[in-house]
Interface confidence: medium
């Protein structure tokens, strides 16, 4: 099991680091989006894991960005963000659809309404129970 956990972390690390770099290879990214969406978590250790990805990094004062699957819908009141950006992406996640759009990446708003926990613990718990 420990070996499996290590392998899983390796795969997740690579997925995060290469996120969005190859539009032709999105299966791993979509699987990870689905994990974040279902387990209500973001990143491996923490949401900031996503900020190592060049296409997601803002400058010092700009908002960083994360995959929309990191968004906590129950904490988000901004209907514009919900209707135009997050819900379309999450509905695709719900159907495990295979299409990717630029809307898959969302800016972190001032009151960061994203899941604050990384996914590591939840996944490890899931592995232990199966």
């Amino acid at each position: 099991r420990a070996q499996l956990e290590r392998s899983l972390r390796d795969v997740v690390e690579k997925t995060i680091q290469k996120y969005g770099t190859n539009p032709e290879e999105t299966a791993a990214e979509e699987s990870w989006d689905y994990v974040q969406f279902q387990l209500r978590c973001c990143g491996w250790h923490y949401p900031q894991d996503w900020f190592q990805v060049l296409i997601l990094r803002g400058n010092g004062s700009e908002a960083h960005r994360v995959p929309c699957s990191c968004y906590n819908l129950s904490a988000t009141n901004d209907s514009t963000i919900l209707d135009k950006v997050i819900l379309p992406q999450l509905s695709r996640l719900g159907h495990l659809a295979r299409s990717r759009h630029s809307a898959d990446i969302c800016a972190v708003p001032a009151e960061s309404h994203i899941y604050r926990e990384g996914c590591a613990q939840g996944l490890q718990k899931w592995l232990h129970n199966n």
Epitope: E13, V108, S112
Partner: antibody, heavy 116, light 107 residues
Framework: EVQLVQSGAEVKKPGESLRISCKGS????????MNWVRQMPGKGLEWMGN????????TYNRKFKGQVTISADKSISTAYLQWSSLKASDTAMYYC?????????WGRGTLVTVSS | DIQMTQSPASLSASVGETVTITCRTS??????LAWYQQKQGKSPQLLVS???TLAEGVPSRFSGSGSGTQFSLKISSLQPEDSGSYFC?????????FGGGTELEIK
């Protein structure tokens, strides 16, 4: 421009209490964790812990748990590091640092001197 | 806790030379490693994050590499302003820990 402004140097006696502060500006204060790092005279850096200012959740280095309290007031974009009873060994420079994974912006430090 | 072994503890080099500082971790930290520079009497400054991503405004003569347990910071074409202390730090599992530091002197 991102800035972390720390409170001024403090000279205290053993057993006294102290709270030092770090005010963030030029960015979304609640979107980043705030860390505290200790540097004893002539020594290296030690991560003490951090706070998520949005939810108020704290994470401590075991070495410092129970020795200090980290808190934040998001309404004034300020994080705090507090001691209830200082010791001579708490003499050090204390830095606050914002984190996005690594610590990308640092305050100038608050020198705390504890001496009888 | 993850132990960070940084070497050398100090080094001296001339302007224009290339130096490499290494950092070894006691456990796999993947790419969760940062490098900082600290000048005398100043606060640390982030140079490199996630093992190899250069921080904003850092000259391209600095470069980070490595993953897992072995990392290095290379400074090519040394400049007088590069003198100071350099620290590695992992930002993987808590507690985050720093290397002991490398004091760089420019001859």
């Amino acid at each position: 421009e991102v800035q972390l402004v720390q409170s001024g140097a403090e000279v205290k006696k053993p057993g006294e209490s102290l709270r030092i502060s770090c005010k963030g500006s030029g960015y979304s204060f609640t979107g980043y964790n705030m860390n505290w790092v200790r540097q004893m005279p002539g020594k290296g850096l030690e991560w003490m812990g951090n706070i998520d200012p949005y939810y108020g959740g704290t994470t401590y280095n075991r070495k410092f748990k129970g020795q200090v309290t980290i808190s934040a007031d998001k309404s004034i974009s300020t994080a705090y590091l507090q001691w209830s009873s200082l010791k001579a060994s708490d003499t050090a420079m204390y830095y606050c640092a914002r984190s996005v994974g690594p610590m990308d912006y640092w305050g100038r430090g608050t020198l705390v001197t504890v001496s009888s | 806790d993850i132990q960070m072994t940084q070497s050398p503890a100090s080094l001296s080099a001339s302007v224009g030379e290339t130096v490499t500082i290494t950092c070894r971790t006691s456990e796999n930290v993947y790419s969760y490693l940062a490098w900082y520079q600290q000048k005398q009497g100043k606060s640390p400054q982030l140079l490199v994050s996630f093992a190899k991503t250069l921080a904003e405004g850092v000259p391209s003569r600095f470069s980070g590499s490595g993953s897992g347990t072995q990392f290095s910071l290379k400074i090519s074409s040394l400049q007088p302003e590069d003198s100071g202390s350099y620290f590695c730090q992992h930002h993987s599992d808590n507690p985050w820990t720093f290397g002991g530091g490398t004091e760089l002197e420019i001859k």
